[in-house]
Structures are given as C-alpha cells and as structure tokens.
Interface confidence: low
C-alpha cells in the first residue's frame, strides 16, 4: 500500500520538511502532490511526468517545493501556513490511481520569554503576586520554575490562563525566587531571565549571639543581634532597660561583675512598622556554675489509689535553671492526671492510680550544668473493694 511519511513530523519554522513516499508502484506514468486531504486541481503543488522527467508547478506552488524521481517532495523554508495535510496521487500504468495522504506541523522558533508581575515588592502574609509569561503564542506549553525546580504542589500556587499566569497567594519570605518561565513547543524551548521578588517581612524575633550566658571578668563582651527582616532591621540595645546605642553589635571591653544583667536587642522594620525584642541574661563570673542538688518533697508518700492526690515539689536555690521530672526513667508528665505548675517546680497527680507507684526524681539544669535530686518513693494503697451500690457499709 502506498504511504507517505513526513520527515520530520514537527518542523521548525524556516526549516525544511521531506514528504517521503513508501511502496511506490513500479509501473507509473506520473504523480502529483496536492495541498489538503484530497485531490483538488486548484491546490496542486507540482506534477511529475516520469517519461519526460519533467516537473510542472501547480497553482499551489510557492517555489519552495522540489519533487524527486522517487515521488518524495521537499518543502524548504516552511512557514506556519504550510502546516496541514498533503496528498500524493500516483497514476499507475494500469491507469488505476492510488492516493496517500500525510501531514506535518510547523511550529515557530520561540522567542525568549519575559515575566511581567503585578507586584514586585509584596508584603509577607498579606499580598498576592501574579506573574505572567509573555508573549502569548499558539500551540505553546508554559512551564514555571522556582529556584531552578519545577513547581511544587502547594495550595498557595495557582496556575491559570493556560498556565501562562502563576499566582502566589499570600507570599512568604521564602517566595523570593528566582522565578523563570519556559515556553515550549515540539521544536523549540526558551526560558526567560530570572525574576526575583523583593518580599518585605519581619523583623522576626531577634537572635543574640553568641549564645554564651557566662563570661569571665576581664573578658570582652561582644554581642551581635540579628533579626530576619527585609528591608534589614534597625537595631538598638538596652542594658537593664536603659538605652545604650543604635547598632547591630554591642561591644563592652574588660567586663566586670557589674556588667551582669539583662541585655535587650530591639529590632525595627521601618517599612512593615513591626518591632521585636529579645532579652539575654549575661552573667559575669569566674566560676563555671554548678547547679546544686535539688530537694524533692511529697505532700504524702503513701496514698490511696483512685482517691487521693499528691503534690511533689522540687526545691532549689539556684536561679536561671529549668526543672524536669522523671518517673521510672521516663520523662513526665506522662498522663492527663499529671500536671506541672509553678515553673515545673510542682508535679501534681490527681487522682493517684496504681501505676503511679514508684520512684520519682527531679532534675535541675542550666545550659552548662545539671543535677538530680535523690529519688522519692510513692506508695499507692487500695482500700477494700467498693460496694456494688457505691455506698460504704454501715
């Protein structure tokens, strides 16, 4: 059977396409190529007479076509108007005509796209931003890249307008980008220059570094404050509530114990109008502080199960410490009946149950030291079984 094949099927505008013919019959008088899906003399491109090896252009001939003795047709410098069907009719020596139809698609060489934005300076958690990939072209696939990666699945990212528009709902500081759009068709692809968002945010709660709390007398105290912010935050320092200076770094040489106190960093963003502060305690001492052993006390050490409650108290004279509780090597609280209060100094169990019997201890700690109390044993007794009617005998 006579067939035709386009090489290539997808053609870039300005390139050439060869309409190859397969299974061409042996005994032929000639053949003709027509534009379209049927034989139409008004749309004949070229006719070829085998006996004379003469090619005759038809009404649809553009001067860019070349026919070969094997019936293949070369079309050069194709345009998008050349897209479509082409029909070959062969006139066999038995005068039986045979036809075959093929097709190809011409796509433009895509230009370098660009990104337009409705808001290039959005405010975090407030503004939405719509990016549009230009230009709008037919038969084009629009792809988006964020940080050189394809779009993540996110409810905050919406595509519309045939994927030509990317909308970021409620931008965050992590949405800075860069953003790129890519346009693709079967014969070409092109990517835009990257576009970044200047997301206004912050300041976040400042961080004071280094994290050290304890310093030796005679050392230099150099504190640096940083709060994530765009535009960058303006900083100021207070010591024990008294304003010191408007700098990001605070430097005090040759400190003494009198420099112990509360150091406050204040961060301000003039664009968002937001302020944040962080307070750091500085302790100037020669010693590497050692937390003393805490004392543990119980309101009672023998209780009645399902009836009594008990309070365990962890006592320490140390300051600047944290407290945690342990029961059978497990961290507490471990059930809804256990409550911590007064800065974790008190552990309350209400009501006490059989499984609460055992050894309890508390631990006090600061960033560089910790110590544990002696264990305390909680005994849980049960009275005689209650009466079925819920009343005591008597």
């Amino acid at each position: 059977q006579l067939t035709t094949e386009s090489m290539p099927f997808n053609v870039a505008e300005g390139k050439e396409v060869l309409l190859l013919v397969h299974n061409l019959p042996q005994q032929l008088f000639g053949y003709s190529w027509y534009k379209g899906e049927r034989v139409d003399g008004n749309r004949q491109i070229v006719g070829y007479a085998i006996g004379t090896q003469q090619a005759t252009p038809g009404p649809a001939n553009s001067g860019r076509e070349t026919i070969y003795p094997n019936a293949s047709l070369l079309i050069q410098n194709v345009t998008q108007n050349d897209t479509g069907f082409y029909t070959l009719q062969v006139i066999k020596s038995d005068l039986v005509n045979e036809e075959a139809t093929g097709q190809f698609h011409v796509y433009p060489e895509l230009p370098k796209p660009s990104i337009s934005s409705n808001n290039s300076n959005p405010v975090e958690d407030k503004d939405a931003v719509a990016f549009t990939c230009e230009p709008e072209t037919q038969d084009t696939t629009y792809l988006w890249w964020i940080n050189n990666q394809s779009l993540p699945v996110s409810p905050r990212l919406q595509l519309s307008n045939g994927n030509r528009t990317l909308t970021l709902l409620s931008v965050t500081r992590n949405d800075t980008g860069p953003y790129e759009c890519e346009i693709q068709n079967p014969v070409s692809a092109n990517r835009s220059d990257p576009v970044t968002l200047n997301v206004t945010y912050g300041p976040d709660t400042p961080t004071i570094s280094p994290s050290d709390t304890y310093y030796r007398p005679g050392a230099n105290l150099s504190l640096s404050c940083y709060a994530a912010s765009n535009p960058p935050a303006q900083y100021s320092w207070l010591i024990n509530g008294t304003f010191q200076q408007s700098t990001q770094e605070l430097f005090i040489p040759n400190i003494t114990v009198n420099n112990s106190g509360s150091y406050t960093c204040h961060a301000n963003n003039s664009v968002t109008g937001c302020n944040r502060t962080t307070v750091k305690t500085i302790i100037v001492t020669e010693l590497s502080p050692v937390v003393a052993k805490p004392q543990i006390k119980a309101s009672k050490t023998t209780v009645t199960g399902d009836k009594d409650s008990v309070n365990l108290t962890c006592s320490t004279n140390d300051t600047g410490i944290s407290i945690r509780w342990f029961f059978k090597n497990q961290s507490l609280p471990s059930s809804e009946r256990m409550k911590l209060s007064q800065g974790n100094t008190t552990l309350s169990i209400n009501p006490v149950k059989r499984e609460d019997a055992g050894t309890y201890w508390c631990e006090v700690f600061n960033p560089i030291s910790k110590n544990q109390s002696d264990p305390i044993m909680l005994n849980v007794n049960y009275n005689a079984l209650p009466q079925e009617n819920g009343l005591s005998p008597g």
């Epitope: 590497s288 050692v290 544990q372």
Partner: antibody, heavy 121, light 111 residues
Amino acid sequence: EVQLLESGGGLVQPGGSLRLSCAASGFTFSNYAMSWVRQAPGKGLEWVSVISHGGGSIYYADSVKGRLTISRDNSKNTLYLQMNSLRAEDTAVYYCARDPTKGYAPTFDYWGQGTLVTVSS
Amino acid sequence: QSVLTQPPSASGTPGQRVTISCSGSSSNIGNNYVSWYQQLPGTAPKLLIYADSKRLSGVPDRFSGSKSGTSASLAISGLRSEDEADYYCGAWDGRLNGYVFGGGTKLTVLG
C-alpha cells in the same frame, strides 16, 4: 606542639607532703581547664581534681578531699598539686591533663608523661 | 570499684571488629558526654573519642564511639596488632561532681 611535663614526684613517708608541678607549653594555658589523674601501679585511671581555666572553680575526688590541693599559676603556665597527709594508697603515677572544653563537656585531649609518687615507710 | 563498668578484657584477631562496652547511670553517661582513651603499655593515656562519637583529629576511622541511654561503646574495626592496649571510658558525674573512669578493658590481639 602541646606539651605537658610533670615533675616533683618521688618517695615520701606516710603522713608526708609533696608538691607536683606540671609545666605547660605550646598552647594558651590560661584558656584551658586542667586536671590531675592518677594511676596506681597495675590499676586503672582515677581522676583526682580539676581546676577551671581561671582557677576559681575547683573539684576533688572524694578520696583526696582535704588532703590534696590543686592550683595554677597562669603567668607561669604551670599547674600544681599540693599533697599533704599522704597515704600508701596515694602511691601512683600522677598525670596532668588538659580539658579543651573548659569543663562544659569534660574530656582530656593532652596528657603529660606522668610522675611517680611512692608513699612508703 | 569503678563508677563506670567495663569488661576487664576483650580479644580479637587481626582484621576483626571488637566492641568494648561501658555502663553507667543517668548521673554520668545518661546526661553527660562520654570519652574513650587508649593507653599503650608504659605510656600515658591518649584520647580517641570525645562527645560520645567524635573522633579526635588523627585518630583512624577504624575507631568509633556510640551511646544509648546510660551505656556507651567503643568499636574497633579492622583490628591491628598495634591496637593491643588498655581502653578506658570516662564521663563527668553530676552527682559526684567529678570525672569518673571505667575500670579499663585490656584488649588482646590474638595470633
């Protein structure tokens, strides 16, 4: 090169006294907590005492409390161990050792070669 | 008796992997960093592992440390004859306010 060189060991009678020294070089001595660790003949290691880099914080093993005193002279890059009321069980090789963590995660990265203290009548 | 418990001896043939354990309590290993020391015969101890699992610079990666709860262990892979030594674990003890060592493990490389 970090070096710790102990000296002052020797034979002493029970109840007697001895002062060990540890000369440090190759590092900023005043930046490190220092310890004394001892090892009785054929036995394992036993920590004796630690002193903070500034000398203000000191701890002792229970076995030596009240008899041994640790001290340091940062201007001389030297660590000391004053040993009083010595007992036969104090017989050991005494090592000085450097703690690079200022005592916050105690470990001993450099040790001296040790000095032998023998308490015997 | 040592606060930290180690097996008194361990052995292996060259190329083998040997593990030395060290058991303590919440006041030492459980809440503080563990170090491992090697003492070759007639020499001062030498630090191998600190902060539970960090190798001191220059220590071969055949030595590795780990910790779980109140126990720690030192693993030596690709055992060599020069690894024959005494090995000690150590940690700060918050209750005693002092540094404690294990009793030491004598490692013998057989063959």
